[in-house]
Interface confidence: low
């Protein structure tokens, strides 16, 4: 769409002339029944830009049309009129010289100001002299300047001060947004917005609140973001750390200690040795140290702005002893032995000197029984004889006053060939024992009967002591892992003690019992 080639002239066109013009115009297109409307493009306009009031469904047969400022037709507020026949635009009282009307009735307003905001009414004069009207509107907003951030405290103290940022300028009809580290504001009780979001207050600042902070101002036609602002948060000093972390040094070495405490502004450091001031530096260097340099080394950190001080004390020991003990090796003469029969020697070997050795079995310090002996400066552990309870994990530890190290563990297995109690007796063995016991009891009964029958005067005094032992489960029922929980696994040992005296007149029918025999009959109750 081009502008009108001719400038807007203040021309009065008599209605008779308009009627004559209309009569000369012939429109063959059928009239439209659609509603006359006007649309603002854009609806929100930046100040200084232009807006087009676009017309839809313009009737075909018409004399002309006229635009007015406001929501109604008011001659005093006419902007421009247009007569189709003469293609002549006539400015009205409300014309500012920035308006252009097009043959399709659309109105262009250039270099808009905020005073242009509001309603505009189009009046269409049809060839039958019936008028139609349509009203549209637009809103003019200022082009926003680049904002800036002012602060009431650019050097706040951590955990003490609050900081209020204000976004300038204070513009009307503007939305204020804030960004921290290029992120929108997090939800935090320490962040408060006020003054229509123009002021951002940080309560009780921390060292992590340095920013950067940006504010953005927005209206429907423009947005602008400030330059970033950072906070110089004063804090610290935190508790200093002394590095390196080593405690032990050899004589002749150089002692170089460095102290650091997080602080803003950076901390001022001083060193004390055994409570005596040495120097005001961050690093302490002592060449060619001796045992006399052992002691407590204090780093003192001070922040002159916060007025806070922190100290850290480190103990330094200068010694010939090795600060690192090598891992010892453990060897066994055998790792699988027979209980109550074999012995075993465990040896702990190390290349370090000036060290001591200790032994551990199932986290217990050794030796733990008379059968265990340490020899060769504790390097060898001897177990003689090995018992069932000696089975398990052994390891040794080498140490000096400043360091220690452990060997890898070694496993000692203990077997019992005669009576592998862990696995119980086979049904055949149990049957054999039961039969033997029954037979023995029967034999004894026959012998007794004989003695009683013959009524010998030189009778053996016969004492029987029949006892029943029910040992606790914990002592006698290891490794019954398939038994259901909470079910008692009882092993009953019946012990028959025979105290036999030699009969004065032995009888061939009765065997002589020369020793007390103890026979275990193991019966598992399931």
């Amino acid at each position: 769409m081009g502008h009108l080639s001719a400038p807007l002239h203040r021309v009065r066109v008599p209605w008779q002339g308009l009627l004559l013009t209309a009569s000369l115009l012939t429109f063959w297109n059928p009239p439209t029944t659609a509603q006359l409307t006007t649309e603002s493009m854009p609806f929100n306009v930046a100040e200084g830009k232009e807006v087009l009031l676009l017309v839809h469904n313009l009737p075909q047969q018409l004399f002309g049309y006229s635009w007015y400022k406001g929501e109604r037709v008011d001659g005093n507020r006419q902007i421009v009129g247009y007569a189709i026949g003469t293609q002549q635009a006539t400015p009205g009282p409300a014309n500012s010289g920035r308006e252009t009307i097009y043959p399709n009735a659309s109105l262009l307003i250039q270099n808009v100001t905020q005073n242009d905001t509001g309603f505009y009414t189009l009046q269409v004069i049809k060839s039958d002299l019936v008028n139609e009207e349509a009203t549209g509107q637009f809103h003019v907003y200022p082009e926003l300047p680049k904002p800036s951030i002012s602060s009431n405290n650019s050097n706040p103290v951590e955990d003490k001060d609050a900081v209020a940022f204000t976004c300038e300028p204070e513009t009307q009809d503007t939305t204020y947004l804030w960004w921290i580290n290029n992120q929108s504001l997090p939800v935090s009780p320490r962040l408060q917005l006020s003054n229509g979001n123009r002021t951002l207050t940080l309560l009780s600042v921390t060292r992590n609140d340095t920013g950067p902070y940006e504010c953005e101002i927005q209206n429907p036609v423009s947005a602008n973001r400030s330059d970033p602002v950072t906070l110089n948060v004063t804090y610290g000093p935190d508790t200093p750390t002394i590095s390196p972390s080593d405690t032990y040094y050899r004589p002749g070495a150089n002692l170089s200690l460095s102290c650091y405490a997080a602080s803003n502004p950076p901390a001022q450091y001083s060193w004390l040795i055994n409570g005596t001031f040495q120097q005001s530096t961050q690093e302490l260097f002592i060449p060619n140290i001796t045992v006399n340099n052992s002691g407590s080394y204090t780093c003192h950190a001070n922040n002159s702005v916060t007025g806070c001080n922190r100290t850290t004390v480190k103990t330094i020991i200068v010694t010939e002893l090795s600060p690192v003990v090598a891992k010892p090796q453990i060897k066994a003469s055998k790792t699988t032995v027979t209980g109550d029969k074999d012995s075993v020697n465990l040896t702990c070997s190390t290349n370090d000197t000036g060290i001591s050795i200790r032994w551990f079995f199932k986290n217990q310090s050794l030796p733990s029984s008379e059968r265990m002996k340490l020899s060769q400066g504790n390097t060898t552990l001897s177990i003689n004889p090995v018992k069932r309870e000696d089975a398990g994990t052994y390891w040794c530890e080498v140490f000096n006053p400043i360091s220690k190290n452990q060997s890898d563990p070694i496993m000692l297995n203990v077997n019992y060939n005669a009576l592998p109690q862990e696995n119980g007796l086979s049904p055949g063995a149990i049957a054999g024992i039961v039969i033997g016991v029954v037979a023995l009891v029967a034999l004894i009964a026959v012998a007794l009967a004989c003695f009683l029958h013959f009524g010998k005067t030189g009778r053996a005094s016969d004492q029987r002591d029949l006892t029943e032992h029910k040992p606790s489960v914990s002592n006698h029922t290891q490794d019954h892992s398939n038994d259901p929980p909470n079910k008692m696994n009882e092993v009953t040992y019946s012990t028959l003690n025979f105290e036999a005296q030699q009969p004065t007149q032995p009888t061939s029918a009765s065997p002589s019992l020369t020793a007390t025999e103890i026979i275990y009959s193991e019966v598992k109750k399931q």
Partner: antibody
Framework: QIQLVQSGPELKKPGETVKISCKAS????????MNWVKQAPGKGLKWMGW????????TYADDFKGRFAFSLETSASTAYLQINNLKNEDMATYFC??????????????WGQGTSVTVSQ | DIQMTQSPSSLSASLGERVSLTCRAS??????LNWLQQEPDGTIKRLIY???SLDSGVPKRFSGSRSGSDYSLTISSLESEDFVDYYC?????????FGGGTKLEIK
């Protein structure tokens, strides 16, 4: 050029009401707020508050809450200061001053010539 | 409220002399400070905005500066029309506050 022209001097009795006008020209009135400033005879300047010329919302300093009212006639690009129930201590010169863009330090970039209010029996 | 303490309240000086007026802010106001000049007839105009920026049409002998919380207006070489009243104004937070003023008199 930008101008703020205030109404003429006023002579009032205690208890009366005075309304001072400040007509702006040379700029878009609704783009900039308007401040009001009091200067008692032989004294310094005191900020009374301001009015948002876009929304019409006034803001008053603590000492000027109650009897003082800011208003607008936007179509005439005019701001008004009304003082009700005049007291002797209200005798002063009152200035309007445009509230410019604060970004450029505009705070009070253009001033009216002042309106003298005399309160006398 | 932010207090603006202006000194001196009056100052006698000679033509061509260099003078400085000072305003001290009770809180941090950043650069949000203007200097105003008031003629004997009551007319007020702004000389300096944002601490140190010169308004258009203001002679270059006027300058503004800041040192911490002290803000200064310096006139490098006094001329006869400079012997009037001067005020500072802070606008960082509401209520906006003025200094008490300095009356510059010819010696």
């Amino acid at each position: 050029q930008i101008q703020l022209v205030q109404s003429g001097p006023e002579l009032k009795k205690p208890g009366e009401t005075v309304k001072i006008s400040c007509k702006a020209s040379g700029y878009i009135f609704r783009n900039y707020g308007m401040n009001w400033v009091k200067q008692a005879p032989g004294k310094g300047l005191k900020w009374m508050g301001w009015i948002n010329t876009y929304t019409g919302e006034p803001t008053y300093a603590d000492d000027f809450k109650g009897r003082f009212a800011f208003s607008l006639e936007t179509s005439a690009s005019t701001a008004y200061l009304q003082i009700n129930n005049l007291k002797n201590e209200d005798m002063a010169t009152y200035f309007c001053a445009r509230r410019g863009w604060l970004l450029t330090g505009g705070a009070m970039d253009y001033w009216g010539q002042g309106t003298s209010v005399t309160v006398s029996q | 409220d932010i207090q603006m303490t202006q000194s001196p309240s009056s100052l006698s000086a000679s033509l061509g002399e260099r003078v400085s007026l000072t305003c001290r802010a009770s809180q941090d106001i950043g650069s949000s400070l203007n200097w105003l000049q008031q003629e004997p007839d009551g007319t007020i105009k702004r000389l300096i905005y944002a601490t140190s920026s010169l308004d258009s049409g203001v002679p270059k002998r006027f300058s503004g500066s800041r040192s911490g919380s002290d803000y200064s207006l310096t006139i490098s070489s006094l001329e006869s029309e400079d012997f009037v009243d001067y005020y500072c104004l802070q606008y960082v937070s509401s209520p906006w506050t003025f200094g008490g003023g300095t009356k510059l008199e010819i010696k």
